[in-house]
């Protein structure tokens, strides 16, 4: 599998409609929770929780602040922590508790605390529960949590130093935690947790499972340096711990290695960055997408692997275990365990079979089973990705977060659209197209190029958004910018499953937002632009330049995959010649203008799509080079003369439908010049679609005027 190509289109922050939320002097917007039914996005930040309108996040609905007292700050600072940054309350857990409350935990100046947030009054209830084991002490430490049926499952560190890792369930009747032992958790960096519900039609009375994803220091591989290993672990919701062995500890904690590598090149991605569980009506078993980087990442490599949850479950249900053996000099080595496995199977959830054997709860499990799982939490079998290879490998980028949306194209093909954020504040949107990756676009979400800390995807039909949190705020972006593709060719070449060309309106429309039937819409995921109708309208720009000056002819081709070239009187121009130059790889510069440079210039783009080359006329310019006469000024108009080479530009729209082009008597130009009314336009010219014409008050056409401009383009 080759590296993913560059994004086809790059949208700068100001180019697209992005909605932003930030409260001045509030930072670290790292916890996001969406309530689809209330159309509310809850945002946990440093010392604050906000509720904003999920359809327009700039609209704040509620705010509540949870600050650290000066006394607490001082005590924290005495322990060597920074009063300005670390000794504050970073909201780290933001989970739904009921229809009317959220469960919120914060680092609270290295004294983690949790509280209930009443959503009606938007006030904390003041419970001030100890957050130890639910929330990290240190805002820099890793954490993950998920609320399952009113109980919080979390992975974090249990002490001030962050040296004791823990996966726990906070429960009034049955709190559980991991053993504090290297075989269970070895310096983990927690990434994600989620619950996978048992299938309703499950015959074996199986239990819901909670999955944890983290990177930890390997116990099974010994090198000179510490080898990091990505892990998937799971516990059973019904686990109640053991009666004597593993009392108040998980009896169902098992973990396995996640494989994400490129076999042909020996590239191993062993640092897990983020995980997204894709649930879709069309999926029998959820698929989880995991985002990785290599341990030694000096070149900026990132990869995405997709896994069937059934593959992981198979490893836990039927896979081999690993065992530690002591070799010379008390050196511990982990190898495959081939001995007898006690019954019931260690780490298994209590199902119908176990109940039939009278094991109705983990409290009934025999010591042999419990002791085995205590000593053998690590599986020998690894969890391998779908197709045994990454979905995407990207060079020169550090991806930070991932969300995935399953959508159907017009032809019925289903695509998993990956939205992946970067450590420079951008969002990549990518799909797999016939065993290759197509990065549809890159959107600069954050102006200051700061890392995206959290990504969230709304799943409500109609209004779909991606929400991204960073240190400075939250940004809301639509799933697609279809309307930005101005021509049918652009719309088709985007190969965006969300977008299709609508010939009646001559616009690129978002599929999921069109209630009308999709008949007549054009979408070709192969990128075959020949399906586009012939252009009915075209436009060209007419410029007048003075002799000896320099002209810059614009060509706005957004595609990063296209090569732009220029034609003059149907001959291809050599941009390297002394006569011509390219500005920003697209705009044509013509130096030392003479009458021989007058004529028609066309900017064409050439884009390889699969095995085809698609050519497009992007812009057409008619250039006239003149010796500037003395300006004739209308008596009623004072004209200021300035130095420069541009005289005037005008825009003509040509039509092949028999309608006459708009002909304002006089047009203002980008350089402030005023030109004659246009001559009748030739028909059938190629298009440069959106051109804004600013007309000035009409003047009699016989008052011929030329203005020299200071605009030296």
């Amino acid at each position: 599998m080759a590296f993913a190509p560059i994004p086809r289109i790059t949208w700068e922050h100001r180019e697209v409609h992005l909605v932003q939320f930030h409260e001045p002097d509030i930072y670290n917007y790292s916890a996001l929770l969406l309530s689809e039914d209330k159309d509310t996005l809850y945002i946990g930040a440093r010392e604050a929780v906000f509720a904003v309108n999920a359809l327009n996040i700039s609209e704040k609905q509620h705010e509540v602040y949870w600050k650290v007292s000066e006394d607490k700050k001082a005590k924290c600072a005495e322990k060597g922590k920074s009063k300005q940054t670390e000794c504050l309350n970073y909201i780290r857990v933001l989970q739904p508790l009921s229809a009317t409350s959220l469960y919120v935990c914060g680092t609270n100046a290295f004294q983690p605390a949790c509280d209930h947030l009443n959503l009606t009054s938007f006030k904390f209830l003041g419970k001030n529960e100890d957050g130890k084991g639910r929330c990290p002490f240190d805002p820099a430490h890793s954490y993950t949590s998920v609320m399952v049926d009113g109980e919080l499952y979390s992975g974090t560190s249990y002490n001030f130093l962050g040296s004791e890792p823990i996966i726990s369930r906070n429960s009034s009747h049955s709190p559980l935690r991991t053993e504090y032992a290297i075989p269970w958790l070895n310096e983990p960096s927690f990434v994600f947790a989620d619950v996978i519900r048992k299938s309703p039609d499950s015959p074996d009375g199986e239990d819901d499972r909670v999955y944890f994803f983290f990177t930890e220091v390997s116990v099974e591989y010994e090198f000179v340096f510490r080898v990091l290993i990505p892990r998937i672990a799971r516990v059973c919701k019904g686990d109640q711990g053991g009666l004597r062995t593993l009392q108040k500890k998980w009896t169902s904690f098992l973990k396995a290695r996640l494989i994400c590598s490129r076999p042909d090149s020996g590239l191993v991605f062993n640092v897990l960055r983020d995980v997204f569980v894709l649930r879709s009506p069309g999926l029998k078993v959820p698929v989880f997408y995991a985002l990785f980087t290599p341990q030694l990442n000096n070149v900026g490599l990132s990869a995405v692997c997709a896994y069937n949850l059934s593959t992981a479950e198979e490893v836990f249900s039927h896979g081999k275990y690993m065992q530690s053996t002591t070799v010379e000099q008390s050196h511990t080595k982990w190898v495959r365990y081939n001995g007898p496995v006690p019954k019931p199977r260690p780490g298994a959830c209590i199902d119908s079979e176990a109940r039939a054997a009278n094991y109705t709860s983990s409290l009934n499990l025999p010591d042999k089973t419990l002791q085995f799982v205590k000593d053998h939490p690590l599986m020998d079998d690894s969890v391998t990705p779908i197709d045994n290879r990454p979905r995407l490998i990207k060079k020169d980028v550090n991806y930070t977060q991932i969300v995935v949306d399953r959508t159907q194209a017009l032809d019925g093909t289903v695509y998993d659209v990956m939205f992946v954020s970067t450590d420079r504040g951008a969002l990549h949107k990518a799909i797999s197209l016939e065993h290759a990756v197509h990065i549809i676009e890159e959107t600069q979400l954050f102006q200051d190029f700061e890392p995206v800390q959290t990504l969230l995807l709304s799943s409500k039909k109609g209004n779909r958004f991606v929400y991204a949190g960073s240190n400075s705020g939250v940004v809301q972006a639509p799933l697609a910018f279809c309307g930005k593709h101005g021509t049918c060719e652009d719309c088709v070449l985007a190969r965006d499953p969300y977008c299709a060309w609508s010939p009646p309106t001559a616009t690129c429309v978002a599929l999921h937002q069109t209630e009308s039937p999709s008949r007549g819409l054009i979408q070709e995921m192969s990128g075959d632009a020949s399906v586009c109708p012939d252009k009915s309208k075209g436009s060209y720009r007419q410029h007048f330049f003075k002799h000896g000056g320099t002209a810059e002819l614009k060509c706005s081709q957004k595609s990063n995959l296209a090569r732009v070239f220029w034609k003059f009187q149907n001959g291809v121009l050599k941009a390297e010649s002394p006569k011509y130059g390219l500005m920003g790889r697209k705009n044509l510069l013509i130096f030392n203008l003479s009458e021989g440079d007058s004529g028609v210039y066309q900017c064409l783009s050439e884009e390889r799509v699969k095995n085809k080359t698609v050519f497009q006329v992007v812009a057409k310019h008619v250039l006239e080079v003149k010796v500037v006469p003395k300006p004739v000024v209308a008596p009623t108009l004072s004209v200021v003369q300035t130095e420069g080479s541009r005289i005037a530009t005008k825009v003509l729209v040509a039509s092949t439908q028999g309608s006459s082009p708009p002909t304002p008597a006089v047009q203002a130009t980008s350089s402030g010049a005023i030109t004659l009314p246009p001559k009748p336009a030739p028909t059938g010219t190629s298009c440069e679609p959106k051109i804004v014409i600013n007309t000035v008050p009409q003047l009699h056409s016989e008052k011929t005027m030329y203005l020299k401009s200071s605009d030296n383009r």
């Epitope: 002097d25 509620h62 705010e63 938007f122 006030k123």
Partner: antibody
Framework: EVQLVESGGGLVKPGGSLKLSCAAS????????MYWVRQAPEKGLEGVAY????????YSVDKVKGRFTISRDNAKNTLFLQMTSLRSEDTAMYYC???????????WGQGTSVTVSS | DILLTQSPAILSVSPGQRVSFSCRAS??????IHWYQQRTNGSPRLLIK???ESISGIPSRFSGSGSGTDFTLSINSVESEDIADYYC?????????FGGGTKLEIK
């Protein structure tokens, strides 16, 4: 003890300019957002301009946009309000106040009087 | 802009009485309302923040309530030193507007 002391007010002709200052002490000035609030004679309070702790966010109300500029010097613990193209309706007592999310306007200065009259 | 309407414009009460000031917002503002007291020739002083949160140093007779669009500041036993103008202010949406104020007089 927290102190905010405004200065720079006075009598000015319409179209004229003034620069107000607010000297802060007794708290970590660079941690706080700051506000200028004014009160015309016998009238209510009106927020005029806001600046965040690090000057990254600046707001001003429409009626003073383009005429008033709020700024701060964290090294000198001072807040400023540069007022130009003054109008008679800008006549008011000008207060500086701290603004911190979660704290509201918890500290106020004693005010400085600005009179715009020909 | 969000409009805050305070009523009544003037409140006249006897010492020891309970008094309530009303502030109504033109749209829902959650609990992002703050109350200030301004005595004659003095600077405003924060009494209550975020609708109901008390401020250290402010007498406990001052309390606040409400959410959404209707808010109340109460003084449970008025004292002569409470003679002042009382303003509400919202912080849900910029510009952070003030109400027109209510003047408290003692009979």
């Amino acid at each position: 003890e927290v102190q905010l002391v405004e200065s720079g007010g006075g009598l000015v002709k319409p179209g004229g300019s003034l620069k107000l200052s607010c000297a802060a002490s007794g708290f970590t000035f660079s941690d706080y957002g700051m506000y200028w609030v004014r009160q015309a004679p016998e009238k209510g309070l009106e927020g005029v301009a806001y600046i965040s702790s690090g000057s990254s966010t600046i707001y001003s109300v429409d009626k003073v946009k383009g005429r008033f500029t709020i700024s701060r010097d964290n090294a000198k613990n001072t807040l400023f309000l540069q007022m130009t193209s003054l109008r008679s309706e800008d006549t008011a007592m000008y207060y500086c106040a701290t603004w911190l999310p979660g704290n509201a306007m918890d500290y106020w200065g004693q005010g400085t009087s600005v009179t715009v009259s020909s | 802009d969000i409009l805050l309407t305070q009523s009544p414009a003037i409140l006249s009460v006897s010492p020891g009485q309970r008094v309530s000031f009303s502030c109504r917002a033109s749209q829902s503002i959650g609990t992002s309302i703050h109350w200030y007291q301004q005595r004659t020739n003095g600077s405003p002083r924060l009494l209550i923040k975020y609708a109901s949160e008390s401020i250290s140093g402010i007498p406990s007779r001052f309390s606040g309530s409400g959410s959404g669009t209707d808010f109340t500041l109460s003084i449970n036993s008025v004292e002569s030193e409470d003679i002042a103008d009382y303003y509400c202010q919202q912080s849900i949406r910029w510009p952070y507007t003030f109400g027109g104020g209510t003047k408290l007089e003692i009979k």
